[in-house]
């Protein structure tokens, strides 16, 4: 290889070892009968060298730096050439660096020909391996503007006081043009301006200078977005941090055409504007940081440009003014990410502040609209707390657990509506009474309704899930000892039609010691499947649960267990089951950690099944599934 650099070209070439690889044989640059690992070539020099291996691209990289001095003479503006030409360089991963130094009062503009640039974040790489790293200068400090790939929206970057542009090309890449030109501009009076041009629908993710490190103190950075007038743009902040300000306030400012309040100032934690028509600017303004504990200001955001949606002009009123302790979140439902462009899906408050998720709280009336091509991409999750602090006031008080109609009228599917039911410890318990009797979901008899109630303990330290219940069964009521959460979870859009079947009343009742009591009134000819809470994880240790099973006068109940043994192994205490006839009080007691489970038994009168757990050894849990079947009495045994 021969590299000759013209005199006065201000070019330096450096060939050096790249990232070390676990290649068995080292490779060297061979020059003047020497094996070296770094070679520097300066302006005016002509160097001949070879490599000691067949694939030097696996070992070495080449850096070509051109210093452009705009301080002492005219600046060579215009299209930037790749010098020396890539065809004259060894086929190594190469980085062309242009270091332009200019006066503070001079603005420099990098103009990128099509394809424009797409900014990438830390840890990301470009599909074709071609990256553009751009940095500026504040006095002697280098500021990283960002790293960019091809095929994006960034068309121009304006800076002042100097710019360093590094173009990294993989050894196999045929590119032989820089793809950008430099122009001079008047002072921009800020760190930089990045212009992002959208031709049609698309998105751009952009970051503050130095991201993920801190944005320079008290600096200003502007993004100018060029958006066709018929499209709408929405801004969402993906990630941000605020520094500790001594003076001034960190903020973002929008210049939105047609707005009467330009510039519109937002805090970084605010919901950002959405549904904007046409071009707009966004500026990030830093503050004077606390010298002792500065913290860092950083921002990563996304601009989504898409056609206005039909829904974007409809306003929905969500009236939560009469609600208490309730929050409603509209958010994207989890989906597999596709690689192609997907239009954004936003929910907007007052038609302006749009984001991919929105939480509405009780006590207010909210006006929302949607900027979304397909509302099935969103769902709603609601949480409401009903708590009793004074047991004398609450006792026997009832509340209806019903989804408010305002929420049902929204064009977004309800996913979960959770009621957190809180009672004073050891003073009150709860009873859930459904409008329609409930069926417990089991593998043997799964629920096939459009919604279910998920009942679980709401005590943080307690891992107790009573089960999933849907309308159309035999469970008349569920009594629970203490705090629980009841979640209405929908499984199909048809919930809107079946909404009338929902309805659960909770009442505060005198305290009882058992963890839960299920009242079961089986229907004739249907098999009722029941299982212990925390199925698959095992009934928590020392927990007791009961089933109160009603048997009509003219029927016989067959109680069947689906295992021969319970499988529980006790570390301490005993696990037992009591089956007690309610009329005679006659009871059978089974040791679950020793005995075999009873064979199918017939009960002519209502009876109790009570299961109490020991402290089991791990992996040997107590899970029981049983069924109750009613059949008509053939002989009157009374």
């Amino acid at each position: 290889f021969e590299i000759a650099l013209p005199r006065e070209s201000n070019i330096t070439v450096l060939i050096k070892l790249g990232t070390p690889t676990l290649l068995a044989k080292p490779c060297y640059i061979v020059i003047s009968k020497r094996h070296i690992t770094m070679l520097s070539i300066k302006s005016g020099e002509r160097i001949v060298f070879t490599f000691s291996c067949q694939s030097p691209e696996n070992h070495f990289v080449i850096e070509i730096q051109k210093n452009i001095d705009c301080m002492s003479g005219p600046c060579p503006f215009g299209e930037v050439q790749l010098q020396p030409s890539t065809s004259l360089l060894p086929t190594l991963n190469r980085t062309f660096i242009w270091d332009v130094k200019a006066h503070k009062s001079i603005g420099l503009e990098l103009q990128f020909s099509i394809p424009r640039l797409r900014q990438i974040g830390p840890g990301e790489s470009c599909p074709d391996g071609v990256t553009h790293s751009i940095s500026g200068r504040i006095d002697a400090t280098v500021v990283r503007i960002g790293t960019f790939c091809s095929n994006g929206t960034v068309s121009r970057i304006k800076m002042q006081e100097g710019v360093k542009m590094a173009l990294h090309l993989p050894w196999f890449h045929p590119r032989n043009v820089s793809g950008f030109s430099i122009a001079n501009r008047s002072s921009i009076k800020r760190l930089c301006i990045i212009e992002s041009v959208f031709e049609g629908e698309g998105s751009a993710t952009l970051m503050s200078a130095n991201y993920p490190e801190g944005f320079p103190e008290d600096e200003l950075m502007t993004w100018q977005f060029v958006v066709p007038a018929h499209l709408r743009a929405s801004v969402s902040f993906l990630n941000f941090n605020l520094s500790n300000c001594e003076r001034k306030e960190e903020r973002v400012e929008y210049y939105i055409p047609g707005s009467t309040t330009n510039p519109e100032v937002f805090k970084l934690e605010d919901k950002q504007p959405g549904n904007m028509a046409g071009n707009f600017n966004l500026s990030l303004q830093g503050c004077d940081q606390d010298a002792q504990s500065p913290g860092i200001l950083r921002l990563q955001f996304q601009v989504l440009v898409q056609h206005p949606q039909n829904e974007s002009n409809k306003i929905y009123v969500v009236d939560l003014s009469n609600e208490r302790a309730m929050s409603l979140t509209i958010e994207p439902r989890p989906v597999k990410q596709s690689r192609k462009f997907v239009p954004g899906c936003f929910v907007c408050l007052e038609s302006r502040t749009c984001s991919s998720n929105l939480t509405l709280t009780s006590g207010s009336k909210h006006k929302i609209s949607f900027l979304c091509d397909d509302l099935t991409r969103l769902w709603m999750n609601v949480e409401k707390t009903i708590s009793c602090t004074d047991h004398r006031y609450c006792q026997r008080k009832s509340y209806s657990l019903q989804v408010p109609s305002d929420i049902l009228h929204l064009p977004v599917e309800l996913h979960d509506f959770s009621w957190k039911l809180l009672v004073p410890k050891d003073r009150l318990s709860l009873v859930l009474v459904p409008a329609q009797k409930l069926q417990q979901h089991t593998h043997e008899k799964p629920c096939n309704t459009s919604f279910s109630y998920l009942v679980a303990s709401a005590i943080p330290s307690q891992d107790l899930y009573f089960g999933s219940f849907c309308p159309g069964g035999s469970i008349k009521q569920i009594q629970v000892k203490q705090n629980i959460s009841v979640t209405l979870r929908t499984f199909a859009p048809s919930f809107q039609q079946e909404a009338s079947r929902q309805g659960l009343t909770v009442s505060f009742i005198p305290y009882f010691k058992e963890e839960g009591v299920f009242t079961v009134t089986p229907d004739t000819k249907s098999k009722v499947y029941l299982r212990t809470p925390n199925w698959d994880r095992g009934l928590p240790s020392l927990t007791s649960v009961s089933w109160n099973i009603s048997v009509p006068r003219d029927q016989v109940a067959c109680l069947t267990f689906f295992k021969e043994r319970s499988g529980v192994v006790c570390q301490t205490g005993r696990a037992f089951m009591i089956i007690q006839e309610q009329r005679t009080r006659a009871e059978e007691i089974f040791s679950l950690d020793e005995d075999v489970l009873p064979k199918p038994s017939f009960h002519h009168h209502s009876f109790w099944v009570n299961i109490s757990n020991c402290s089991p050894t791990s992996g040997k849990q107590l899970d029981l599934l049983f069924s109750v079947t009613l059949t008509p009495r053939t002989v009157d045994l009374t």
Epitope: V30, I31, S32, K33, L39, K42, I47, V48, T50, S52
Partner: antibody, heavy 121, light 112 residues
Framework: EVKLVESGPGILQPSQTLSLTCSFS??????????VSWIRQPSGKGLEWLAH???????RYNPSLKSRLTISKDTSSNQVFLKITSVDTADTATYYC?????????????WGQGTTVTVSS | DIVMTQAALSLPVSLGDQASISCRSS???????????LEWYLQKPGQSPKLLIY???NRFSGVPDRFSGSGSATDFTLKISRVEAEDLGVYYC?????????FGGGTKLEIK
Amino acid sequence: EVKLVESGPGILQPSQTLSLTCSFSGFSLSTSGMGVSWIRQPSGKGLEWLAHIYWDDEKRYNPSLKSRLTISKDTSSNQVFLKITSVDTADTATYYCAREGSANWEAMDYWGQGTTVTVSS
Amino acid sequence: DIVMTQAALSLPVSLGDQASISCRSSQNIVYTNGITYLEWYLQKPGQSPKLLIYKVSNRFSGVPDRFSGSGSATDFTLKISRVEAEDLGVYYCFQSSHVPWTFGGGTKLEIK
């Protein structure tokens, strides 16, 4: 134009240290691949390579004389030096410096005119 | 050390004749990069040596094309197709593939 000029003491006595200087112009010893060699030639005899110094200060010596030789350079003043300690009459010779560079055929393409050194008591 | 042997101490030739000077190395002088660093120098009386051929067969700039070099591994030859008066002097082969770099003893080209 490339030019090399050797200079030395002319005459010196046995056991003394011989100091030679090669002053050059037309190239820079900071250029990668560039180097300067010292070669000597006793009168009426053949050539003997002594030492070589590279742009990055790496040095090569003839093992038969290594313990007595020291080659060095001053890049900024375009000079290369050779010191030979404990000289005796066998060191009487014409001493040449020559440049070698990677862009210059990796051979000694330019030589100085030589400086004659006589060791005699 | 690699010994470079020039068998003929002198080679008498007539002007206009072809001259062939041989040089043998005591071992292979191919460098690790596959290049053989074998050079030929001519020293005229009272002058410093001048480079004629580098890397076995490449003529240095300004050297007339009547000079050619050949050979490989351990055997090398310098040919002068038509000897001219200005070609007279001592020819040295030189290897710089392995340290110490070594010169041959020289072959004096003289008029018959």
